[in-house]
């Protein structure tokens, strides 16, 4: 048998003007009852009974998962990164087959010197993390490598990483133009062939808080939006207070529905309130408006 659930009611008037009772369980929607032992519950919107209470799925909460939360946790990564695939030609080292073997003494030494050289080249770039050689091939030594960039997540992270990749291009172009062989010898840590410098590909971390917010809001995606506070994104509905997009319900309660946020106006002993924002008060005894 279906369990009977005590329903407490609050007298609220919708912004359209009719007085409605809002039960803690929405009895207008068919619900399934799951019975676990002696416990039984009506968990709606995909929620499930864990033996004590309903475990609700985002964006729902409440005893029966019938209410929509005002804010949804979104967690941008602490750091975001970019990877640049570059090729440079080192002329100050003669290629040998041992360089193909990443565990060889030759490769390890080349890797150390190349890393040291690139650390010098990119030393002024705060986003620079390091380089990773992916392949060495003949011609003097053609060095296929990744330049790794990282920065703290901010709303402008893409601009920061885009700017850093431009500086990387400028710096590698400069060093491979300046550090060249003279009379078949190199006076720098490493020398390069100017024409051998190429940027093959750039991959930037993709993180969109708006997209995460919309996905987590599910069928309420059109009504949740992202606002920033201290460079951190918040996924909120208009019913969340303290943000630019917050809905002011004055003498009422903000409630999310599938048509968006609406104000449920309260009725007190002396007044009833109406209007879209519950800001029109009518005194019960005298029937005149207070604005």
């Amino acid at each position: 048998p279906l369990a009977t659930i005590p329903v407490s009611t609050t007298s609220l008037t919708s912004s359209e003007g009719s007085t409605i009772s809002t039960p803690s369980v929405d009895i207008s929607t068919p619900v399934t009852t799951s019975i676990v032992g002696d416990q039984c519950s009506r968990c709606k919107n995909g929620g499930f009974w864990d033996g004590l209470k309903c475990q609700c799925l985002t964006p729902y909460y409440g005893e029966s998962c019938e209410e929509v939360v005002n804010s949804i946790d979104i967690a941008p990564p602490e750091t975001v990164s970019a990877q640049m695939e570059l090729t440079v030609t080192v002329t100050s080292v003669k290629f040998t087959d041992e360089l193909k073997n990443h565990s060889s003494q030759e490769f390890r030494e080349f890797n150390k010197t190349f890393t040291e050289q690139m650390n010098i080249v990119y030393s002024g770039i705060p986003e620079y993390v390091g380089v990773n050689i992916t392949n060495l091939r003949l011609g003097s030594v053609v060095v296929e490598h990744d330049v790794l960039l990282r920065t703290k997540y901010t709303p402008e992270y893409k601009t920061a990483l885009d700017n850093a990749t431009e500086v990387v291009k400028q710096k590698i172009t400069k060093v491979t133009t300046e550090q060249i062989m003279t009379n078949d010898n190199c006076s720098a840590l490493m020398c390069f062939n100017t024409t051998g410098t190429q940027v093959q590909n750039i991959t930037v971390t993709q993180y969109d808080p708006v997209e995460e917010c919309r996905q987590k809001a599910e069928e309420y995606e059109d009504y949740f939006l992202v606002e920033y506070r201290d460079q951190k994104p918040y996924c909120i509905s208009p019913c969340e207070s303290g943000f630019n997009a917050s809905k002011n319900c004055n003498h009422g309660k903000c409630q999310m529905s599938q048509n968006g946020a609406r104000c449920l106006c309260v009725t007190t002993e002396t007044h009833w309130y109406s209007g879209e924002d519950c800001n029109q008060g009518t005194q019960k005894s005298h029937h005149h408006h207070h604005h």
């Epitope: 100050s92 080292v93 003669k94 078949d184 190199c186």
Partner: nanobody, 124 residues
Framework: EVQLVESGGGVVQPGGSLRLSCAAS????????MAWFRQAPGKEREVVAF????????YYADSVKGRFTISHDNSKNTLYLQMNSLRAEDTAVYYC?????????????????WGQGTMVTVSS
């Protein structure tokens, strides 16, 4: 790990000769680079000569060309510097350097392995 030990330094009169030796150990290949650098008091370390042990390349600084000869004995893994017609300005600590790569750079920072150095004094 590569280790280098120099010998053969000493005091010699101008116009005299000396032969420096550098014994290398720890190499996994028989193709690598070896060099002689020197550092005079109050001056930067500078290249004297370098050689590829496969015989593919030798280099001499302009100041020693025609007077110094660099050579390598593969069977003994030893580098030599034959110094003739020595001058007062050749006085310095002479260092043996090595790389597992076939280097074409005269920048000391590019050479990862170093000996302790041997003193050469040219004085009358």
């Amino acid at each position: 790990e590569v280790q280098l030990v120099e010998s053969g330094g000493g005091v010699v009169q101008p116009g005299g000769s000396l032969r420096l030796s550098c014994a290398a150990s720890g190499y996994t290949s028989n193709r690598y680079s070896m060099a002689w650098f020197r550092q005079a008091p109050g001056k930067e370390r500078e290249v004297v000569a370098f050689i590829w042990t496969d015989g593919g390349r030798t280099y001499y600084a302009d100041s020693v060309k025609g007077r110094f000869t660099i050579s390598h004995d593969n069977s003994k893994n030893t580098l030599y510097l034959q110094m003739n017609s020595l001058r007062a300005e050749d006085t310095a600590v002479y260092y043996c350097a090595a790389s597992s790569l076939l280097l074409q750079t005269i920048n000391p920072r590019a050479w990862p392995y170093w000996g302790q150095g041997t003193m050469v004094t040219v004085s009358s």
